[in-house]
């Protein structure tokens, strides 16, 4: 059955299936792939929505998977396994039986190994830096109507604390957002940075997790702001732990 | 496809009052942020009001501010604009949208918001 026969929608995450079924007959919606029940007041964990968009039929993936040695997020096309919260588990396993580390946003922090790899535990992402590079314009946007209105998506369209965004940079025509959120910062109810970015990094390709959403619609008085480039940065707690030849490679 | 229908607009006399209601065709709008907005003749469309989904906090514009009141009912799928001393200027288009926002304020762009409804006329006349 769909949501929309169940008359019941999840606005924060339509790879869901919902149903009035809840109680009191009121709405409950469970993730495509892992059936987890998600909260519809805000944002679906990262985990959840890479299993969901793994579920999908083959033909809806557009995108294709950059270079094992990137620098940067491989877009996290894999299956994850995820803990009864939604977070993503410490070590992730292909169907071939190797193995790796990944920190809280689900990219790989070691070298890949087999079954007897240990994470002992899920490092956290504590900074994200991401970078983004605006289609050219008659002349630079203001820099501080630029960061308020990006500040106000984070607040108002993420659900992510003002006090997370720790600063937006501008020189035309790149924009860094850096957001900033501690284990000892974030507290129960807060949304994570690193699904605040994720939630970003799809509205900015056009693939809005959002009901109703085909993409984002940013403008800074009223100018249309077109991004054409976007490069996501993630720094841990903990360095990652590379062996020299990735390193050099 | 979420379909907004609003009702309760009206003709009513300077100071007096009205309640528009705006409902989902049997969706719950209970994590939607939910706007109210009017268009009076020869003007652009203007934000009135609106009631955020993560705490339900309000924001109201200036020119309706102690005299209008926003509120849901969730239950009822529905929310509400509760308007008193209406004055001449009230007179407009009145508009509900939903927008899978968390948070609502003066700066929320109209572009935010997803869903809109057609409209019911409100004419503050004596």
């Known amino acids: 059955h769909t949501a929309a026969q169940d008359n019941c929608t999840c606005p924060t995450n339509k790879m869901t299936v919902c149903s009035p079924d809840g109680p009191g007959g009121r709405c409950q919606c469970r993730a495509l792939g892992s059936g987890m029940a998600v909260d519809c007041s805000t944002l679906t964990s990262k985990c959840l929505l890479l299993k969901a968009r793994m579920s999908a039929p083959k033909n809806a993936r557009t995108l294709v998977r950059p270079s094992e040695h990137a620098l940067v997020d491989n877009d996290g096309l894999y299956d994850p396994d995820c803990d009864p919260e939604g977070r993503f588990k410490a070590r992730q396993c292909n169907q071939t039986s190797v193995c790796w580390c990944v920190n809280s946003v689900g990219v790989r922090r070691t070298d890949k190994g087999d079954l007897s790899l240990r994470c002992d535990e899920l490092v956290r992402t504590h900074h994200i830096l991401i970078d983004l590079r605006h289609r050219p314009t008659a002349g630079a946007f203001n820099h501080s109507d630029l960061d308020a209105e990006l500040r106000r998506l984070f607040r108002e369209r993420y659900r992510l604390h003002p006090k997370f965004v720790a600063a937006v940079h501008y020189e035309q025509p790149t924009i860094q957002i850096e957001l900033r959120q501690n284990t000892s910062q974030k507290a129960a109810g807060d949304v994570d940075i690193g699904d605040a970015a994720y939630y970003f990094e799809r509205d900015i390709k056009g693939e809005s997790l959002f009901q109703g959403r085909g993409g984002l619609d940013l403008r800074v008085r009223g100018e249309p702001l077109q991004v054409e480039r976007t490069l996501i940065y993630y720094l841990d707690e903990i360095p990652p732990k590379f062996s020299m030849k990735r390193l050099t490679a | 496809q979420l379909q907004l229908v609003e009702s309760g607009g009206g003709l009513v006399q300077p100071g007096g009052s009205l309640r528009l209601s705006c409902a989902a065709s049997?969706?719950?709008?209970?994590?939607?942020?939910i706007g109210w907005f009017r268009q009076a003749p020869g003007k652009e469309r203007e934000g009135v009001s609106c009631?955020?989904?993560?705490?339900?906090?309000?924001y109201y514009a200036d020119s309706v501010k102690g005299r209008f009141t926003i509120s849901r009912d969730n239950a009822k799928k529905s929310v509400y604009l509760q308007m008193n001393s209406l004055k001449l200027e009230d007179t407009a288009v009145y508009y509900c949208?939903?927008?899978?926002?968390?948070?609502?304020?003066?700066?929320?762009?109209?572009?935010?918001?997803?869903?809109w409804g057609q409209g019911t006329q409100v004419t503050v006349s004596s």
């Open positions: 009631i955020s989904s993560s705490d339900a906090s309000t």
């Open positions: 049997g969706f719950s709008l209970e994590h939607w942020t």
């Open positions: 949208a939903a927008g899978s926002l968390g948070y609502c304020s003066r700066s929320t762009p109209q572009y935010e918001y997803d869903y």
